[in-house]
Interface confidence: low
């Protein structure tokens, strides 16, 4: 997260760290007791590595009573996700067992109504991604509030040049932005999960390259079918 600040500890009980061989790889969001939603591209280079999900965490390194690392029983990328596109960049991870719920671990309601969030709406994005362009990784969860950007502006030639489909949404990126390591994390508007941080190689903090988020409402049928 660029231009953000440390989150209040455990105030986002839905927040997950998707880990590869014990290290933070991507963000994720607990959407059901046994399911975490993340970005498909996160596991592209995972190969034979061990993928796990950390729940109930604020610090990645410090012991916390609510922290627990779960093995992954099944990883389900969206069937249409492809390595070279930002489209359909969703991944569902089934935990090895139902998460132990409590004040610091709780699923987040996700948007089912397929309607665009109004431009200018302030949404919260959180993650353990880099906090500066030197690549410094934080130990504690960071967050930032970002205004939603209308699709027409986001699709300008100088911005994302028509790449933002109706299944994607954008948020402003003027010095405050999601960044490397935040992919798969939640964009939360009004207490509801609206978007998932895409995991492309977009530069961060660049006003002319807004943040791109996959609209979960557009994938309600797929999410329901996997969770069923």
């Amino acid at each position: 997260i660029l231009g953000g600040r440390e989150a209040e500890a455990h105030a986002r009980p839905y927040m997950a760290s998707v880990q590869l061989n014990g290290a933070h790889l991507c963000g994720g969001v607990l959407v059901a007791e046994q399911w975490v939603l993340s970005a498909a591209h996160c596991l592209e280079d995972a190969a034979d590595g061990k993928v796990q999900v950390l729940l109930g965490a604020h610090s990645l390194s410090q012991p916390e009573p609510s922290k627990r690392l779960y093995d992954v029983l099944r990883a389900v990328p969206h069937p249409d996700s492809q390595p070279d596109t930002i489209d359909h960049d969703l991944l569902l991870l089934q935990l090895s067992e139902k998460a132990t719920l409590g004040p610091a671990v709780r699923p987040l309601p996700w948007q089912r109504v397929d309607r665009d969030v109004a431009p200018g709406t302030l949404c919260d994005v959180a993650g353990w991604g880099i906090v500066n362009h030197a690549g410094r990784r934080p130990d504690s969860l960071q967050h930032v509030l970002l205004p939603v950007l209308d699709r027409a502006t986001c699709n300008r030639r100088t911005h994302h040049d028509g790449a933002i489909t109706e299944r994607l949404m954008c948020a402003e990126s003027n010095r405050r932005d999601s960044c490397k390591g935040d992919s798969g994390g939640p964009l939360v508007c009004g207490g509801v999960l609206e978007g998932v941080v895409t995991s492309g190689s977009r530069v961060c903090g660049n006003r002319k390259k807004p943040g791109i988020y996959t609209r979960v409402a557009s994938y309600a049928a797929w999410i329901d079918s996997v969770l069923a």
Epitope: L2, N206, K208
Partner: antibody
């Protein structure tokens, strides 16, 4: 120490294309956190941003000039160029090339830390 | 018209303080930068990110940006400070934009 130097014809006929080149020494035009820009100053007036080329080669143009301006680069020569088509007397100005420092990303319009001395271009028949 | 508005001219007595303003409704969101341009020369960066001086710029030059107005202050103006001063920031398209410039005369 970075140095930038403009070159090109000082006189261009109306309706023709103005072509200028900026040669950069002391630093690569492909370096991250910098873009390279063209700025002009009509006689007795203020500065006008025309466009930039980022370190990855992507270009950004002033909306008022977008239909007429093209900025390109030649990394092997460490040069970038400006072409302005269909010129009129209104395009008479001193043209500067400059380095655009970006604080946050490879392209983020920020401030201009190195400027060329400028080249006077007059549009006249 | 420019998205940034500067007075076209300003006079100050030698040794006095000159304040050059730059107004723009997006200045609360963006940094302001200032350039000095002497007759027949290229602009030179003298203040960036509202209030930071590049190395080699005298301490008498300072800047601020508050409430939609950026101000360049020259404390104890010298004869060699007579020049045009340009503010620069970003406009509503997030493109670089300059003010119209202010000519400072040192009396």
């Amino acid at each position: 120490q970075v140095q930038v130097q403009e070159s090109g014809p000082g006189l261009v006929k109306p309706s023709q294309t103005l072509s200028l080149t900026c040669t950069v020494s002391g630093g690569s035009i492909s370096t991250s956190y910098y873009a390279w820009s063209w700025i002009r100053q009509p006689p007795g007036k203020g500065l006008e941003w025309m466009g930039d080329i980022a370190n990855d080669g992507s270009t950004y143009y002033s909306p008022s000039l977008e239909s007429r301006v093209t900025i390109s680069r030649d990394t092997s020569k460490n040069q970038f160029s400006l072409q302005l088509s269909s010129v009129t007397a209104q395009d008479t100005a001193v043209y500067y090339c400059a380095r655009l420092r970006s604080l946050y990303t490879d392209y983020d319009p920020h401030y201009y830390d190195y400027w060329g001395q400028g080249t006077q271009v007059t549009v006249s028949s | 018209s420019s998205a940034l508005t500067q007075p076209s001219a300003l006079s100050v007595s030698k040794g006095q303080t000159a304040r050059i303003t730059c107004q723009g409704n997006l200045l609360p969101r963006h940094y302001a930068h200032w350039y000095q341009q002497k007759t027949g020369q290229a602009p030179k960066l003298i203040v960036y990110d509202d209030n930071i001086r590049p190395s080699g710029i005298p301490e008498r030059f300072s800047g601020s940006n508050s409430g939609g107005v950026a101000t360049l202050t020259i404390s104890g103006a010298q004869a060699e400070d007579e020049a045009d001063y340009h503010c620069q920031s970003a406009d509503s398209n997030d493109d670089a934009v300059f003010g119209g410039g202010t000519h400072l005369t040192v009396l």
